[in-house]
Amino acid sequence: SIPWNLERITPPRYRADEYQPPDGGSLVEVYLLDTSIQSDHREIEGRVMVTDFENVPEEDGTRFHRQASKCDSHGTHLAGVVSGRDAGVAKGASMRSLRVLNCQGKGTVSGTLIGLEFIRKSQLVQPVGPLVVLLPLAGGYSRVLNAACQRLARAGVVLVTAAGNFRDDACLYSPASAPEVITVGATNAQDQPVTLGTLGTNFGRCVDLFAPGEDIIGASSDCSTCFVSQSGTSQAAAHVAGIAAMMLSAEPELTLAELRQRLIHFSAKDVINEAWFPEDQRVLTPNLVAALPPSTHGAGWQLFCRTVWSAHSGPTRMATAVARCAPDEELLSCSSFSRSGKRRGERMEAQGGKLVCRAHNAFGGEGVYAIARCCLLPQANCSVHTAPPAEASMGTRVHCHQQGHVLTGCSSHWEVEDLGTHKPPVLRPRGQPNQCVGHREASIHASCCHAPGLECKVKEHGIPAPQEQVTVACEEGWTLTGCSALPGTSHVLGAYAVDNTCVVRSRDVSTTGSTSEGAVTAVAICCRSRHLAQASQELQ
């Protein structure tokens, strides 16, 4: 019967006793940077071309016995997971292997850098179709390795990497921490994070999504027909590389940003038990398990958005945190979050010709996160409209006044340390959805966008008594672009988007002992693009 991992990534409409997805990734070439491989294994023979690239360090220890099958074990298994004819994800994809890990699975940053350069030169000399580069390795944070990944990604190559098996924040490792790379954590048959001895999958904001990574059956280098079970984030990354190859084969013109958004969109949501992660990492770690799209075509009409968390600002009084979208994405809204609740809000600002989301720490605060909502919105023209703190008691307001511009997000930012704790919340007058409102002490920022066929609406959910969490979701066919809290409650820790749901978090009322701080209202801005829907109908 079908291995559990292949069943897990297969949408229900394709499920059968055998894994037979509609497109095998035949237009895509996958580069594997790993150990040597046994290319004559019948699972991968004819599918994997072993390049002459080799850059590995000496094995440790004078008594190390170099056994071919052990040297090839990791790479052979991963090649099988990506494109194996029996237990592979993208059965039609062709692969090229580069040896950057020795027989003990060790490599160097310089070896990997030279490997990436080898791929870049190969691409220049003989341009082929879409390229996916699988980096099933993780080492300490390396600015130079991350920069090399960025260069290759900007040349149009899709890089997929393992989050690492250290049960730690993936942002501390490279290439997992490179924003341009698709970073993959590992889950098991129960959709739980993979434990590996005393360690396990890495987690955190640098992980894009998870994928099957425990007891994964694949080609064994022991013999030509041997199969073996292996576990780890390398196996998880191999699944995503295979899914990416299939998506790119179906839609070869997809950009990295479009591919990442689709991977996120088609993932299984909220199936991972977050209790496995350290408490401070739960909100930052995406609860997504990779899956193939239900159809490899026709997703173009959707407005895709994802949430990008910044690094932590640190606790200093004037500390700020910045969240950025990828080059091809539009920043449609900006929010902030602080576990202590002490923050001075957030704002969208231009940096290097692109909007970024900046969050501000407050005096006595333990630090803040900036949360960007990054979307694919072709032909968009977005700008930020700011209203300085108002003198009137009605509070600060700002709206999108340009013809054809719609409100996609609201942010507020204040200079004062204490934002009038006991003032009642300002209520938005009904019938004016195209404006942001806030405290009179705060400056308010409206993200206003014009794009063909773009329409947005505001959705609110208020709870009269304080609650730790208030949510509001966009309905089917609409995409969450903005998430904020109505002003007036000092116990709000911040707001952030989780998939298509706006989450407003408040301080635990039981610990503050006060219930007089009023209602909490979560405000979602939900958008859709009629233009994208019409464009896709014309294509079919």
């Epitope: 019948r42 699972e43 074990s73 004819r85 029996d86 022991d222 013999c223 030509s224 027909t225």
Partner: antibody, heavy 119, light 113 residues
Framework: QVQLVQSGAEVKKPGESLKISCKGS????????IAWVRQMPGKGLEWMGI????????HYNPKFQGQVTISADKSISTAYLQWSSLKASDTAMYYC????????????WGQGTLVTVSS | DIVMTQSPDSLAVSLGERATINCRSS????????????LAWYQQKPGQPPKLLIY???TRESGVPDRFSGSGSGTDFTLTISSLQAEDVAVYYC?????????FGQGTKVEIK
């Protein structure tokens, strides 16, 4: 039920060409390998090669490489063994058999095709 | 190539008696990654195709009588028919299926004494 049905016996002259077939049914043909095995009169079994109909990957026993061609048409769940120029020494019973990645041994066999090459 | 050598070439056993066939491979077919021996046993009766009896050296195929058993590991293997029946008259082959080309033993003919 799962079965492999082979084409009928053939009598040929040396130098002639021949293509024998093996049709699978009762299982997902593209997800299993088909092997061809030769048995010369009164002799043992010799593995000739294998094909994966899903992508037409083949692997030959070096002894038979260049002597025969293994192919498949997945649309009709059929594998083939062919000769471009038969020799008297090709006289034998030829069996097809299937195997799977999780069971890489031959669990189902065809009934065999007897090929006789004589002038 | 892995060479498979069976012994004896032929064997005559009384009905109800034990028949033992040996098979030796020129290199180990036991693999550490999954701790399995990549060895199978087949039975071929006159005018019929081979039939799978045993795989992974000791796992009986469904429908095969329990008088057939396989044992051994690494390079030395044994097929045992605990109580020979008339219908067991056949040629028995061992096969290694780990490495290309896949190879068979030369066969052992089992007859009734």
């Amino acid at each position: 039920q799962v079965q492999l049905v082979q084409s009928g016996a053939e009598v040929k002259k040396p130098g002639e060409s021949l293509k024998i077939s093996c049709k699978g049914s009762g299982y997902s043909f593209t997800n299993y390998y088909i092997a061809w095995v030769r048995q010369m009169p009164g002799k043992g079994l010799e593995w000739m090669g294998i094909i994966y109909p899903g992508d037409s990957y083949t692997h030959y026993n070096p002894k038979f490489q260049g002597q025969v061609t293994i192919s498949a048409d997945k649309s009709i769940s059929t594998a083939y063994l062919q000769w471009s120029s038969l020799k008297a020494s090709d006289t034998a019973m030829y069996y097809c058999a299937r195997d799977h990645w999780s069971r890489p041994f031959s669990d189902v066999w065809g009934q065999g095709t007897l090929v006789t090459v004589s002038s | 190539d892995i060479v498979m050598t069976q012994s004896p070439d032929s064997l005559a056993v009384s009905l109800g008696e034990r028949a033992t066939i040996n098979c030796r491979s020129s290199q180990s077919v036991l693999y550490s990654s999954n701790n399995k021996n990549y060895l199978a046993w087949y039975q071929q009766k006159p005018g019929q195709p081979p039939k799978l009896l045993i795989y992974w050296a000791s796992t009986r195929e469904s429908g095969v009588p329990d008088r057939f058993s396989g044992s051994g590991s690494g390079t030395d293997f044994t097929l045992t028919i605990s109580s020979l029946q008339a219908e067991d008259v056949a040629v028995y082959y061992c096969q290694q299926y780990s490495s290309f080309p896949i190879t068979f033993g030369q066969g052992t003919k089992v007859e009734i004494k």
